[in-house]
């Protein structure tokens, strides 16, 4: 028999977690012992089950973890993991500070979507990562040509909406292009909007003719370039 002990104490060195409101927080207390110990969580010294928390909590006992999504200022406090078995118990305190921030127009991760080169017949994924306080809505647009022109008389580009989605903050939005042809080449825009405003970034898809299999047997199906 053995009292509980921390199996990965190096993963528990970050005691203070200061995170912006709206982010997800994960506390882990990986442990072992004989018999296998149980884990429970306290908040500010009181048993914590998350029933009063909007969105609740996720307890994953096999991962020794507590997960809180979309944290708010009322989530601030000391979180204690209490690990115990018949032989003994250990505990560890995490401090959570939730940083209030001003809601802002969506932020798009730099470099996404990325310029991409693909071969005719291959599949392409264009990625867009959005950070937003308010729930963002996403549109994937393709820039098109009408009557030989990419722009209208007003100077704005002609675009075609390929996909519209409402996503959770900090999710990756993917545009899948299957079996691409030469007509799929062009400029694609990921547009994200929330109640404050819009943000958008674009990327170019280059489609190459089908390569001769006799000399490109080992070539990857699609190449991604920044």
């Amino acid at each position: 028999q053995q009292a509980p002990y921390w199996t990965h104490p190096q993963r528990m060195e970050k005691k203070l977690h200061a995170v912006p409101a709206g982010n997800t927080v994960k506390f882990r207390c990986p442990a072992a012992g004989n018999p296998t110990p149980t884990i429970r969580w306290l908040k500010d010294g009181q048993a914590f089950h998350g029933e009063n928390r909007i969105g609740g909590i996720r307890l994953r006992h096999q991962h020794w973890s507590l997960v809180m999504e979309s944290v708010v200022p009322s989530d601030r406090g000391t979180y204690t993991c209490l690990v115990e078995n018949a032989v003994g118990s250990i505990r560890y305190n995490y401090l959570l500070d939730v940083l209030e921030r001003s809601p802002h127009r969506p932020i798009l991760q730099a470099g996404l979507p990325a310029n991409t080169t693909a071969v005719v017949g291959s599949d392409v994924e264009l990625l867009c990562k959005v950070y937003s306080d308010a729930q963002p809505h996403i549109q994937w647009l393709k820039h098109i040509v009408i009557n030989g022109s990419s722009f209208g008389a007003d100077g704005f580009p002609y675009v075609q909406v390929l996909k519209t989605a409402d996503i959770n903050s900090s999710e990756v939005e993917v545009l899948y292009l299957r079996n691409v042809s030469a007509e799929d080449a062009g400029e694609y825009t990921c547009l994200a909007g929330n109640s404050i405003g819009l943000s958008y970034q674009s990327a170019w898809l280059t489609v190459l003719p089908e390569e001769d299999p006799t000399w490109t047997a080992a070539a990857p199906e699609a190449r991604y370039t920044d």
Epitope: R105, Q109, Q135, Q139, G193, S195
Partner: antibody
Amino acid sequence: EVQLLESGGGVVQPGRSLRLSCAASGFTFSSYAMHWVRQAPGKGLEWVAVISYDGSNKYYADSVKGRFTISRDNSKNTLSLQMNSLRVEDTAIYYCVRGAGRGFPYGPDGFDIWGQGTMVTVSS
Amino acid sequence: DIVMTQTPLSLSVTPGQPASISCRSSRSLLHSDGKTYVYWYVQKSGQPPQLLIYELSNRFSGVPDRFSGSGSRTDFTLKISRVEAEDVGVYYCMQYIEVPLTFGGGTKVEIK
């Protein structure tokens, strides 16, 4: 023609309530966030509140938080501002302003269309 | 909150002469998408504000080309190349990057 028309202003005593409305026409109201901005007599512009296109997100200036409520009725193309516990310092012209839309911005993504404003006077 | 500081408070200009209004933000208005979210308005007597310039330097439709916007990150300028009598009013800058949206205190432009 794109238009915003505010109504509901008037003279009210401190501590009382007032409800402002804004009727939108000439655009797809349900696709746009909407804002209220106010201007005290002889003063500058102060942002008051915003509501998302579907009403799911609302944000307020600290000066009105807990007292004012922004809402919308997309079936009637109407934006509202419920003002409770009014104070003398809430005296202002209240403007309804179109915010960001849901599609590609052919021009500015909002704050391009303003109503004429409605005057609210809080006085004892 | 982002503070928008406008100078000068007032400006008296001879018709046909240039005019320049400055606006400084307490934080960068350059967004991750590469755009700078500063807007400029003019408010004429008894009217609501009218949009002149959006996203730093884009003229709104119908705005005469004598109006131009420039700057970077935290320092912005609205220029009127040749002031006309109809340009009289109060000019405001606004940040449109986060709430609370904030305005400069205004610059009153008068004709000499």
